[in-house]
């Protein structure tokens, strides 16, 4: 994994500047593991950044992701008049000017160095979970999700339909 | 429109049982985590229960002075969601709402208009 | 549990007068970098309806007036010119552990 130095020296200025027309409500620098917990760790390979699934040795340090929430409507056709309420949607970035980044034609999910405003690929509609966990839904997808699949993220198609365990879709943030 | 429309309640003996049903419509149902919320007479309100989704293994969670005494369930296909109630005391009497949370599970934002049990001898 | 603790118990202000409620919850209600907290109104004979969630974040259709503010375990909720609809009791209610658990309320009538 490599150093995320960069990440601890992000300012609110930085943040504060528009990124989808509208500043961040708030934003959280955490570790992203899995249900599991294994850690989520970003390594640079041939200029570009891969994402791995792995268990982490003993004191070894976790990658940090800056989290940056922000409100949005959610794009429900059920309700034109608002009242499936909004919602909480956040982008993941865990090195200066990469985000995390749905691809939803290769259902893969990648890390990508963006323009702002960010494209609606880098943002995920956060869904709160029990056993402290939360999930991160693809804004330009609904119903496919991020999760772990042969140690790599990927995107994932979950049908609330369908009786499937859901704990690869599953993470935990942490501060530490 | 989205509604949620409680039945079921009315009057009670203590230790008497009840089921109360809530019928939802305007929204796909399967998508939306659901809790019971009651208010007694003159009083605050109280959180009661919640289920999750089939994908959730339709997991359940109850306030500690129900557990044991009141369960949660739905039935997708129809579009409803039930409370049974077993060993009722005069403490459950209470406006008793169905709510759902909104889509991501951040807060109730649907809410019905309530049923009355009345637990009394 | 955490207990959600609310004050004042009832409140009576101006019509166009700002009007403050404050929510103190018995442990921090904070997790993932936002606050498990949210605000809902309640009018007589009516459920209550969402103001505020994740302690400042105003729901879908809620007038401007109604803000929110605190993190960990001090909240509040702010009226800033009070309207005559707005006669009502408030709750405070936390959402990151179960069971959710809602403050006594806060009658706020007009003077």
């Known amino acids: 994994a490599f150093g995320i130095s960069g990440v601890q020296k992000y300012t609110r200025a930085l943040h504060d500047s528009s990124i989808t027309g509208i500043s961040p409500i708030t934003e959280y620098l955490a570790s992203l593991s899995t249900y599991n917990d294994q850690s989520i760790t970003f390594a640079l390979e041939d200029e570009s950044y891969e994402i791995y699934v792995e268990d982490l040795k003993k004191d070894e340090k976790k990658d940090k992701v800056l989290l940056s929430y922000y409100e949005s409507q959610h794009p429900s056709n059920e309700s034109g008049d608002g009242v499936d309420g909004k919602m909480l949607m956040v982008t993941l970035s865990p090195t200066k000017d990469f985000w995390l980044h749905a691809n939803n034609k290769e259902h893969s999910v990648e890390l990508h160095k963006c323009e702002k405003p960010l494209p609606d690929q880098a943002f995920f509609v956060l869904h709160n979970m029990h056993s402290n966990c939360v999930s991160f839904e693809c804004k330009t997808d609904p119903g496919v999700f991020i999760g772990v699949k042969d140690n790599h993220l990927a995107l994932i198609k979950v049908d609330s339909s369908e009786n499937l365990c859901t704990e690869n879709i599953l993470f935990k943030l942490s501060e530490t | 429109e989205v509604q949620l429309v409680e039945s079921g309640g009315g009057l009670v003996q203590p230790g008497g049982s009840l089921r109360l049903s809530c019928a939802a419509s305007g929204f796909t149902f399967s998508n939306y985590w659901m809790n019971w919320v009651r208010q007694a007479p003159g009083k605050g309100l109280e959180w009661m229960a919640e289920?999750?989704?089939?994908?959730?293994?339709?997991?359940?969670h109850y306030a500690e002075s129900v557990k044991g005494r009141f369960t949660i369930s739905r039935d997708n296909s129809k579009n409803t969601v039930y409370l049974q109630m077993n060993s009722l005391r005069a403490e459950d009497t209470a406006v008793y709402y169905c709510?759902?949370?909104?889509?991501?599970?951040?807060?109730?934002?649907?809410w019905g208009q309530g049923t009355l049990v009345t637990v009394s001898s | 549990d955490i207990v959600m603790t609310q004050s004042p118990d009832s409140l009576a202000v101006s019509l166009g007068e700002r009007a403050t409620i404050n929510c103190r919850a018995s442990?921090?209600?904070?997790?993932?970098?936002?606050?498990?907290l949210n605000w809902y109104q309640q009018k007589p004979g009516q459920p209550p309806k969402l103001l505020i969630f994740v302690a400042s974040s105003q729901g879908s259709g809620v007038p401007d007036r109604f803000s929110g503010s605190g993190s960990g375990t001090d909240f509040t909720l702010t009226i800033s010119s009070l309207q005559a609809e707005d006669v009502a009791v408030y709750y405070c209610q936390q959402s990151k552990d179960i069971p959710y658990t809602f403050g006594q309320g806060t009658k706020v009538e007009i003077k």
């Open positions: 289920i999750t989704l089939k994908f959730n293994n339709y997991s359940t």
């Open positions: 709510a759902r949370r909104n889509y991501g599970n951040w807060y109730i934002n649907v």
């Open positions: 442990e921090s209600v904070d997790k993932f970098g936002v606050s498990f």
